[in-house]
């Protein structure tokens, strides 16, 4: 089974635009990294800007779900 741990200090630059880095701990596979992006960013490394229109739409959906 795999679980997520926060990246070590030296690995944090895997993610950009303020994204938070996590390492997938999996005994059967080499280390993989995942990014939790800041609002307004997306992509495997948080490299892409989310257009404002989409951001607003996501916020509206979030409020609706609440």
């Amino acid at each position: 089974t795999s679980h997520l741990v926060k990246c070590a200090e030296k690995e944090k630059t895997f993610c950009v635009n303020g994204g938070e880095c996590f390492m997938v701990k999996d005994l059967s596979n080499p280390s993989r990294y995942l990014c939790k992006c800041q609002p307004g960013f997306t992509g495997a490394r948080c490299t892409e800007n989310v257009p404002m229109k989409v951001q607003n739409q996501e916020k509206a959906e979030e409020l609706y779900q609440k």
Partner: antibody, heavy 116, light 107 residues
Framework: EVQLVESGGGLVQPGGSLRLSCAAS????????IHWVRQAPGKGLEWVAA????????NYADSVKGRFTISADTSKNTAYLQMNSLRAEDTAVYYC?????????WGQGTLVTVSS | DIQMTQSPSSLSASVGDRVTITCRAS??????VAWYQQKPGKAPKLLIY???FLYSGVPSRFSGSGSGTDFTLTISSLQPEDFATYYC?????????FGQGTKVEIK
């Protein structure tokens, strides 16, 4: 052993096009981030574009946006930089580099000269 | 875009000298700064990543420090092969940006 080999540079007239290739070996291509960085003669390093082969995310410097296109073929472990509407100020050595936590491996570079 | 301002732009030093190069970011870049060495006609080589971590195979006389906006590359005892140009680069924010370079020359 990790290797990056650029090709496709040469002399081109202003307004012309070139396609640069960056052939990679010795690492998992789809798990990295590929960047193109250029260096004009006697000048410093300037970031040009990047692609994340895993999800196809692309980014461009403002100076090349709309003129250059970065792409990757994971089956060939090769990244490309399609350069259109070339200008004299695009004259430079173009390097590709892999990025894990920084730009850790670099190719030898390929010279692009834009001149009439 | 984030501006990375390196100083000095050039310096003259002797073998055995301690050399310090600084880099200032125009806004907070956390510890997402790398340092590269480039020799004429060659591709840059990574020395330091994440501000203070020595890249594999790089001699221990190279060290990096800093966080936020102020960063330093130190060569504790300059060797003949260290005469080159050094660049800092931030990768906290897109686009990645480089400093203008510091040329280390023989005194």
């Amino acid at each position: 052993e990790v290797q990056l080999v650029e090709s496709g540079g040469g002399l081109v007239q202003p307004g012309g096009s070139l396609r640069l290739s960056c052939a990679a070996s010795g690492f998992t291509f789809s798990g990295t981030w590929i960047h193109w960085v250029r260096q004009a003669p006697g000048k410093g390093l300037e970031w040009v574009a990047a692609i994340t082969p895993a999800d196809g995310s692309t980014n461009y410097a403002d100076s090349v946006k709309g003129r250059f296109t970065i792409s990757a073929d994971t089956s060939k472990n090769t990244a490309y930089l399609q350069m259109n509407s070339l200008r004299a100020e695009d004259t430079a050595v173009y390097y590709c580099a892999t990025y894990m936590f920084a730009m850790d491996y670099w190719g030898q570079g390929t010279l692009v000269t834009v001149s009439s | 875009d984030i501006q990375m301002t390196q100083s000095p732009s050039s310096l003259s030093a002797s073998v055995g000298d301690r050399v310090t190069i600084t880099c200032r970011a125009s806004q907070d870049v956390s510890t997402a700064v790398a340092w590269y060495q480039q020799k004429p006609g060659k591709a840059p080589k990574l020395l330091i990543y994440s501000a203070s971590f020595l890249y594999s195979g790089v001699p221990s006389r190279f060290s990096g420090s800093g966080s936020g906006t102020d960063f330093t590359l130190t060569i504790s005892s300059l060797q003949p092969e260290d005469f080159a140009t050094y660049y800092c680069q931030q990768s906290y924010w897109m686009p990645p940006t480089f400093g203008q370079g510091t040329k280390v020359e023989i005194k």
